[in-house]
């Protein structure tokens, strides 16, 4: 039974705000022509809006976004030897969030 | 092309550690027999291991986990009127993480 649990506290809503998330730097973002290389680092932190809103008609959405270029290392394997190159990946950080109405189907008049 | 950006900083690895994530409290967690109710809050924060490791053979995994019961409100709609009930949901928080070797497929002998 995995041990006895403590008394249940009231659940607190995860408010709509920016949180740190992990962004995977896929190789296809660096080079679509071949897969014979590694990317370092394989993942980075980004700031993203998350959380929930008062009802299902509103969603937690970014209201302010910043694009942040970062330099990664592309490590090509040529004749079993590593060749180091540089590549740029542009990350999307969310700076501010808001519970916004979801675009719903408009009633036909 | 589509817009100029600032100078690219070296990318920093998103290390393997606990981060705050949002956990959606689905109605199925509360009651699998009917869907004629709402849950409040619809989501909560949990601590989860995330990030990446030095190579593809290792993965960021929790080494210590804690179960945390929280009390939510189950709002049943009966004859268009809300009836408030309480329910308990057990959340899983990760307390510690580690880059662990992925269990590979064992060769058939």
């Amino acid at each position: 039974s995995l041990g006895s649990l403590t008394v249940a506290e009231p659940a607190m809503i995860a408010e709509c705000k920016t949180r740190t998330e992990v962004f995977e730097i896929s190789r296809r973002l660096i080079d679509r022509t071949n897969a014979n290389f590694l990317v370092w680092p394989p993942c980075v932190e980004v700031q993203r809006c998350s959380g929930c809103c008062n009802n299902r008609n509103v969603q937690c959405r970014p209201t302010q976004v910043q694009l942040r270029p970062v330099q990664v290392r592309k490590i090509e394997i040529v004749r079993k030897k590593p060749i180091f190159k540089k590549a740029t990946v542009t990350l999307e950080d969310h700076l501010a969030c808001k519970c916004e109405t979801v675009a719903a189907a408009r009633p036909v008049t | 092309s589509l817009g100029s950006l600032t100078v690219a900083e070296p990318a920093m690895i998103a290390e393997c550690k606990t981060r705050t994530e949002v956990f959606e409290i689905s109605r199925r967690l509360i009651d699998r027999t009917n869907a004629n109710f709402l849950v409040w809050p619809p989501c909560v924060e949990v601590q989860r291991c995330s990030g990446c490791c030095n190579n593809r053979n290792v993965q960021c995994r929790p080494t210590q986990v804690q179960l945390r019961p929280v009390q939510v409100r189950k709002i049943e709609i009966v004859r268009k009127k809300p009836i408030f009930k309480k329910a308990t949901v057990t959340l899983e928080d990760h307390l510690a993480c580690k880059c662990e070797t992925v269990a590979a497929a064992r060769p058939v002998t």
Epitope: S26, L29, V89 | L2
Partner: antibody
Framework: EVQLVESGGGLVQPGGSLRLSCAAS????????MSWVRQAPEKGLEWVST????????YYADSVKGRFTISRDNAKNSLYLQMNSLRAEDTAVYYC?????????????WGQGTLVTVSS | DIQMTQSPSSLSASVGDRVTITCRAS??????LNWYQQKPGKAPKLLIY???SLQSGVPSRFSGSGSGTDFTLTISSLQPEDFATYYC?????????FGGGTKVEIK
């Protein structure tokens, strides 16, 4: 293997609405920009809309601006296109496509398409 | 908006032929040009991106060249599976625009 599967197409009257969905698998959906491209019967390709990997940036063709809304749910590996005030000229096969990163603006992998017919 | 003009709109060729399709942009787009192949009833497929880079898995008989306003897609030795419609697309600025297409038919 990259897979994109569109759904939600069908017959709708002028002025009506439809919501298209695209279910993605076989790649890290949350790392890629995504797009919708359409093709009217026996015609060429027309770009409709593009959304950034985090959903914070959206771009539209003038022909759909103010009527269509692109969105995504990275937790569900899903892309959406809410289409309102539909017109006969919106009749087309709608494809969802993976669009690489910020500097790419291409259509790398495509779904099989879903047909939207706007007719009275 | 950047207009993309493809020529010819259609061509007839035989297996083994060298085929060249051109695409012209209404203004300079540097190397921000992509090429796609579409077969009847199927979704398009990316062949070439950034004017000359071959998408992973695409046969080496396909090649792209050009920069600025004039671009070329070349199929060095046409194969039976290459009979299709080819589109160019500029990725220099929004709105993203496609050429009208070139249909490659069997002679």
């Amino acid at each position: 293997e990259v897979q994109l599967v569109e759904s939600g197409g069908g017959l709708v009257q002028p002025g009506g609405s439809l919501r298209l969905s695209c279910a993605a698998s076989g790649f890290t959906f949350s790392s890629y920009w995504m797009s919708w491209v359409r093709q009217a019967p026996e015609k060429g390709l027309e770009w409709v809309s593009t959304i950034s990997d985090g959903g914070g940036l959206t771009y539209y063709a003038d022909s759909v601006k103010g009527r269509f809304t692109i969105s995504r749910d990275n937790a569900k590996n899903s892309l959406y296109l809410q289409m309102n005030s539909l017109r006969a000229e919106d009749t087309a096969v709608y494809y969802c496509a993976e669009s690489g990163g910020y500097t790419d603006w291409l259509f790398g992998y495509w779904g099989q398409g879903t047909l939207v017919t706007v007719s009275s | 908006d950047i207009q993309m003009t493809q020529s010819p709109s259609s061509l007839s060729a035989s297996v083994g032929d060298r085929v060249t399709i051109t695409c012209r942009a209404s203004q300079s787009i540097s190397s921000y040009l992509n090429w796609y192949q579409q077969k009847p009833g199927k979704a398009p497929k990316l062949l070439i991106y950034a004017a000359s880079s071959l998408q992973s898995g695409v046969p080496s008989r396909f090649s792209g060249s050009g920069s600025g306003t004039d671009f070329t897609l070349t199929i060095s030795s046409l194969q039976p599976e290459d009979f299709a419609t080819y589109y160019c697309q500029q990725s220099y600025s929004t709105p993203l625009t496609f050429g009208g297409g070139t249909k490659v038919e069997i002679k």
